[in-house]
């Protein structure tokens, strides 16, 4: 049976945390990605920014789960409207405010 | 360690505005919502409404919907709370409180109240 | 709204005895999330709320045992096994799942 969209973003946001807790080394070799817009399209635009990280196993389930919230195709070197222009930061800590964000839509309800 | 310090004690007018300030410390003021409670003399504690300081979100309790004003300065890490149109039954104690930082499931830290007394 | 209704309103209790206070929800308090947002908070005298418990029954850090949370759906208890002189003030159940948030309209506990 479909899995419930509350039950799909707690999996997601369980993953990030999982990435944040056991990251020792830097995380995708400190690998920089562009900082999005965290409002409307959050998923989507996620994926759009981190598909361009590339090898780095840790993300690589976060990549597919994010995938799966998205409801158009993305591919690598795609960017919506949703990018924050020229600013770019670490992989780590765009997962951080990334895992900040996805928390409050789960306690506001918010799950599409 | 995580402290909310909230602005001193205001006496007002009826008709006048009061702006209440919360400085956050100890955290990032962006990784969670700050809370406005109040408690008028011998009532209960009455929720008045919440910012997300990450995105300006803001959700207000109807009642006070039109009077209260929440904002936020998250470089100065600190929330406000204005309040117009004041009258008598406004004088209370003004709490400001966080939500924790987890999974937003309670208030954790609160501020230490700000007395307001309406009176002509 | 969700209207919380405590009772008794006042409760004069001997210390070593136990103590039990009800909230009633005027509807479920059940969130969209799966998880029903319902604490305790006790007020002592002069200070600002402090967190008992949350969730219906996970006790917060610090908080002696002798307290603990049940209930579901649109009724809820907050024990004290024995209650202590420190145990004065204003217990306020409140719930988080719906806005606007609301609170009881509070349990006085006084030792007899």
């Known amino acids: 049976s479909p899995v419930p969209p509350s039950t799909a973003l707690k999996e997601l946001i369980e993953e990030l945390v999982n990435i944040t807790q056991n990251q020792k080394a830097p995380l995708c070799n400190g690998s920089m990605v562009w900082s999005i817009n965290l409002t409307a399209g959050v998923y989507c635009a996620a994926l759009e920014s981190l598909i361009n990280v590339s090898g780095c196993s840790a993300i690589e389930k976060t990549q597919r789960m994010l995938n799966g919230f998205c409801p158009h195709k993305v591919s690598a070197g795609q960017f919506s409207s949703l990018r924050v222009r020229d600013t770019k930061i670490e992989v780590a800590q765009f997962v951080k405010d990334l895992l900040v964000h996805l928390k409050k839509l789960f306690r506001e309800g918010q799950f599409n | 360690q995580v402290q909310l310090v909230q602005s001193g004690a205001e006496v007002k007018k009826p008709g006048a505005s009061v702006k209440v300030s919360c400085k956050a410390s100890g955290f990032n003021i962006k990784d969670t919502y700050i809370h406005w409670v109040r408690q008028a003399p011998g009532q209960r504690l009455e929720w008045m409404g919440r910012?997300?300081?990450?995105?300006?979100?803001?959700k207000y309790d109807p009642k006070f919907q039109g009077r209260v004003t929440i904002t936020r300065d998250t470089s100065a890490s600190t929330a406000y709370m204005e309040l117009s149109s004041l009258r008598s039954e406004d004088t209370a104690v003004y709490y400001c409180?966080?939500?924790?930082?987890?999974?937003?499931?309670?208030?954790?830290?609160w501020g230490q109240g700000t007395l307001v007394t309406v009176s002509s | 709204d969700v209207v919380m209704t405590q009772s008794p309103l006042s409760l004069p209790v001997t210390p070593g005895e136990p103590a039990s206070i009800s909230c009633r929800s005027s509807q479920s308090i059940v969130h969209s999330n799966g998880n029903t947002y319902l604490e305790w908070y006790l007020q002592k005298p002069g200070q600002s709320p402090q967190l008992l418990i949350y969730?219906?029954?996970n006790r917060f850090s610090g908080v002696p045992d002798r307290f603990s949370g049940s209930g579901s759906g649109t009724d809820f208890t907050l024990k004290i096994s024995r209650v202590e002189a420190e145990d004065v003030g204003v217990y306020y159940c409140?719930?988080?799942?719906?806005?606007?948030?609301?609170f009881g309209q509070g349990t006085k506990l006084e030792i007899k």
């Open positions: 969730k219906v029954s």
């Open positions: 910012i997300d300081p990450a995105n300006d979100n803001i």
């Open positions: 409140f719930q988080s799942s719906h806005v606007p948030l609301t």
């Open positions: 409180a966080r939500s924790e930082e987890n999974w937003y499931d309670f208030f954790d830290y």
